[in-house]
Amino acid sequence: SPVPFGPEGRLEDKLHKPKATQTEVKPSVRFNLRTSKDPEHEGCYLSVGHSQPLEDCSFNMTAKTFFIIHGWTMSGIFENWLHKLVSALHTREKDANVVVVDWLPLAHQLYTDAVNNTRVVGHSIARMLDWLQEKDDFSLGNVHLIGYSLGAHVAGYAGNFVKGTVGRITGLDPAGPMFEGVDINRRLSPDDADFVDVLHTYTLSFGLSIGIRMPVGHIDIYPNGGDFQPGCGFNDVIGSFAYGTISEMVKCEHERAVHLFVDSLVNQDKPSFAFQCTDSSRFKRGICLSCRKNRCNNIGYNAKKMRKKRNSKMYLKTRAGMPFKVYHYQLKVHMFSYNNSGDTQPTLYITLYGSNADSQNLPLEIVEKIELNATNTFLVYTEEDLGDLLKMRLTWEGVAHSWYNLWNEFRNYLSQPSNPSRELYIRRIRVKSGETQRKVTFCTQDPTKSSISPGQELWFHKCQDGWKMKNKTSPFVNLA
């Protein structure tokens, strides 16, 4: 029996599914103008060459136009993130046109077949945009394509095929398999729009990465390093998502890109900042919290256009849920040891006390190893805005807190049996806020008491004379 096919070719050939008893010729891609925030509302279907729906559904030619492009689907239905995004766009841009690109029949396939269909879908979107451009007042510069997973590469094709240049493409965790490392004409790239920004949330550094690892936009943002998203661990998923399985973990991490984008739309008062850095390891070490020379940017919808940059990798930490914003701090700590106990790897925690709130006990993550008699840089972050920092408390975790530390302590003892009392000297800590870019130096309350050992704590207050406090003869203040 006849099956639908459109200008892109026979749908039957692409589906490998039982044939339906249908006679009409139908395009395999539909454009649904979402005319209401209500997800149950059926909206209006637009098709090239038919102007009546544009009038009937009050398509605003001068407003921004968003095209939301879904990715590969195993269920063949629109997933729940879609109406969240539609609603958020309507909330933020009340006059905008929000169009959902429905390519479900071509996406509900084996992954490899769905990948092969992305070009065809991109072509359909480009044809729709070319037709809209024939209308008075419609500007391609007002078009923002938002593609999730495989949909990000569809957006890339659309931007590549359209006559002219689309204003913006946002790639939400663009798909990795079959796109990693390929030519720019066969994946999303900075050439596909005037501004291409990308969020990478599931880029495993080993094995098959669901999201693409390589940078593919003008700016490429890797929240939490682009791999392990808070709230998506196995234990979190079992408790809070339907089907507590590995596939739900994958979904959680992959889809986090969408939720970060939605967050940027609805929580304007809590914008998340990302910071340019060469890699995740350096960011985790707290080295990259600079906003000089456009080295930081808002993420998601609020990202500032940076066309001079290409494939600029940016990083940030986030909370486990909305609002995702955290407050980043760089700590520069000079650690000195009289014992030259080179193997000492202390487990340190810091508590920040601010004018608005106090932080929790924050671990100082040792990315490589602590250098003694040198300045060590750490990254810490808080979920609350602490306000102006007033003081801080440094704690060296005692022996009994964990088996790992017990083993560490034992190893340290074996390597230095003659010197069981381990001590570090820390006279001051320099703190820089990523969000405000303010720098403050904190000194020990009592300059004569700057030593800390396992199980002890050390208090720091704002130095009286700020940055100028330098003692040339002291071995403690050789700050980088």
């Epitope: 099956v3 639908p4 749908l11 589906l15 599914k17 039982p18 044939k19 339906a20 008893t21 249908q22 139908k26 395999s28 539909r30 649904n32 979402r34 209500d38 997800p39 149950e40 509302h41 059926e42 909206g43 279907y45 195993m74 269920s75 063949g76 239905i77 629109f78 997933e79 729940n80 993130w81 879609l82 109406h83 969240k84 539609v86 959902v100 429905d102 479900l104 029949p105 509900h108 408790g239 809070s240 998502f241 339907a242 089907y243 507590g244 939720h259």
Partner: antibody, heavy 120, light 112 residues
Framework: QIQLVQSGPELKKPGETVKISCKAS????????MNWVKQAPGKDLKWMGW????????TYADDFKGRFAFSLETSASTAYLQINNLKNEDTATYFC?????????????WGQGTTLTVSS | DIVLTQSPASLAVSLGQRATISCKAS??????????MNWYQQKPGQPPQLLIY???NLGSGIPARFSGSGSGTDFTLNIHPVEEEDAATYYC??????????FGGGTKLEIK
């Protein structure tokens, strides 16, 4: 107003085939997915699967793969459920129910049901 | 598959009193702040009718004496005050974005 009208009751013998229809009116047929739900006598509701009324692509629940087929006649705004090689355990009332593609997948309108009796 | 367990299997409530029906899911049906749990009423010889969608939203034309609550794995349908015409079987139904979609075993409500 929105209506889903199903075909009348069927009495069939084991091994035979039945085709139940569900005619939609009052809305654009292709803009909503169509589900099929089974209710055996005195039993609870069992979701059989759904069909994309635009593309014609069916999705079947695991228990309904093989002998069951969903199809469409879009020009007549009608969905069909065909059951091949009927068995006694297919005796039940079958409902069609629509859902919104863009929404939260609840079934807002139902057909009146078609009673199928399979008996030798 | 997500299994929905309804309790009680049947209950009898006096006219004007409150009827409470519970539905427990084997796994969470929440997604980003929304609960994908629905409730239907079915009278003998009739198709089910949507009462509540997304845990707490009233279906079109449904009287306000019906209300739904809950999140995660535990959901409740309340009817207050119960009326004569509410005698029926009530089903919960989960509609997360990863089928198969499933129904609970039903609760038969009798009016005393």
């Amino acid at each position: 107003q929105i209506q889903l009208v199903q075909s009348g009751p069927e009495l069939k013998k084991p091994g035979e085939t039945v085709k139940i229809s569900c005619k939609a009116s009052g809305y654009t047929f292709t803009n909503y997915g169509m589900n099929w739900v089974k209710q055996a006598p005195g039993k609870d509701l069992k979701w059989m699967g759904w069909i994309n009324t635009y593309s014609g692509v069916p999705t079947y629940a695991d228990d309904f793969k093989g002998r069951f087929a969903f199809s469409l006649e879009t020009s007549a705004s009608t969905a069909y459920l065909q059951i091949n090689n009927l068995k006694n355990e297919d005796t039940a009332t079958y409902f069609c129910a629509r859902f919104s593609y863009y929404g939260r997948h609840y079934f807002d309108y139902w057909g009146q049901g078609t009673t199928l009796t399979v008996s030798s | 598959d997500i299994v929905l367990t309804q309790s009680p299997a049947s209950l009898a409530v006096s006219l004007g009193q409150r009827a409470t029906i519970s539905c427990k899911a084997s796994q969470s049906v929440d997604y980003d702040g929304d609960s994908y749990m629905n409730w239907y009423q079915q009278k003998p010889g009739q198709p089910p009718q949507l009462l509540i969608y997304a845990a707490s939203n009233l279906g079109s034309g449904i009287p306000a004496r019906f209300s739904g609550s809950g999140s995660g794995t535990d959901f409740t349908l309340n009817i207050h005050p119960v009326e004569e015409e509410d005698a029926a079987t009530y089903y919960c139904h989960q509609s997360t974005d990863d089928p198969p979609w499933t129904f609970g075993g039903g609760t038969k409500l009798e009016i005393k």
